[in-house]
């Protein structure tokens, strides 16, 4: 239903990485505009992205208020230049999004190896603790702050001179691994939330190798 010159939005899709969260939809508007509303299951609707011709809406500011809540959004379609117009049922045409729980569903962004330091036959590899847009007491929380021990990292490492790989896990942002003296190693890390059933793993970090800028060596 709805007015003859508006179509309902469709393919409503949440795109979320490290809690930066955007709702996308189709179609590209022709003689119509959109407004988005978001709410928690028990909360009131809040309007965002008023009368926009975009087909996306950044809802980060809303979902970071409580990342463990489940959110629902809806996209209203209005005729361009006549936003007061309503559908045949007396209200604007709209479409609901799938439910979205940020804590369980936001994608884990590609991690970055911050540094590695060799001391004898040990190497300490540190993963950058990425800042999110989740706030507490007016400060932005890191990924570790938000997920705590639910977040682990997997390290892959190998001698530059061979293809044989090893792996290690940590529930902090640091690895301490044994290496052969005099050998250069390469490293890549991956973020994992083992308790999840979807979006469990990030993509691998860029590979960092000893003998390059980020490292430090001490006898």
């Amino acid at each position: 239903s709805g007015t003859t010159n508006t179509v309902a939005a469709y393919n409503l899709t949440w795109k979320s990485t490290n809690f930066k969260t955007i709702l996308e939809w189709e179609p590209k508007p022709v003689n119509q505009v959109y407004t988005v509303q978001i709410s928690t299951k028990s909360g009131d609707w809040k309007s965002k992205c008023f009368y926009t011709t975009d087909t996306e809406c950044d809802l980060t500011d809303e979902i970071v208020k409580d990342v463990k809540q489940t959110y629902l959004a809806r996209v209203f379609s209005y005729p361009a230049g006549n936003v007061e117009s309503t559908g045949s049922a007396g209200e604007p045409l709209y479409e609901n999004s799938p439910e979205f729980t940020p804590y369980l569903e936001t994608n884990l962004g590609q991690p970055t190896i911050q540094s590695f330091e060799q001391v004898g036959t040990k190497v300490n590899v540190t993963v950058e603790d990425e800042r999110t847009l989740v706030r507490r007491n007016n400060t932005f929380l890191s990924l570790r702050d938000v997920f705590g021990k639910d977040l682990i990292y997997t390290l892959y490492y190998w001698k530059s001179s061979s293809s044989g790989k090893k792996t290690a896990k940590t529930n902090t942002n640091e690895f301490l691994i044994d290496v052969d003296k005099g050998e250069n190693y390469c490293f890549s890390v991956q973020a994992v939330i083992p308790s999840r059933t979807v979006n469990r793993k990030s993509t691998d970090s860029p590979v960092e190798c000893m003998g390059q800028e980020k490292g430090e060596f001490r006898e």
Partner: antibody, heavy 117, light 107 residues
Amino acid sequence: QVQLLESGAVLARPGTSVKISCKASGFNIKDYYMHWVKQRPGQGLEWIGGNDPANHHSMYDPKFQGRVTITADTSTSTVFMELSSLRSEDTAVYYCARDSGYAMDYWGQGTLVTVSS
Amino acid sequence: DIQMTQSPSSLSASVGDRVTITCKASQDIKSFLSWYQQKPEKAPKSLIYYATSLADGVPSRFSGSGSGTDYTLTISSLQPEDFATYYCLQHGESPYTFGGGTKVEIK
């Protein structure tokens, strides 16, 4: 529900190779790590190696390095283990297992490989 | 490589007994320790993950404790179906290593 279905028992000659498979259902293998574990008759469990199907990283126990290759075909949700230069002590049950990051939470039913001339 | 020392290698117990099995790692494994039950001719079954968390469908008489290098599996009140072999596994670092196993037999 989650299932790991392994290929059937194999009889192989010493010096040859064997390739066994593990077909996963009920989950996306790219979201997990997949491993192979060996158990000789009457003995304990021994980790052979593992694979991350999302990025094709494979890791092996040094005892098996050079003789074992673990691969994954994400299009068919199947993990493979190929073991070469077979000897009598490779006679064992081989299990595939899913690694959640916290544990090997699901296991296949096991594939018996018998190496005999 | 990390060595896992599991003890005892076998024990005899009666239904209703409290049973404790320990695993000691040769270095800190940061709680990447899991416990498995295996019955004859069957695949291992996950009991405890991340040192202390109970796997789905596992009775609450099973519990795990420990951190660092020392870990324990406890069966608070042994049931007839608990007679089996138990293994610990460290998966904090490759090569992953299992304990030698503990066979729990009927006294």
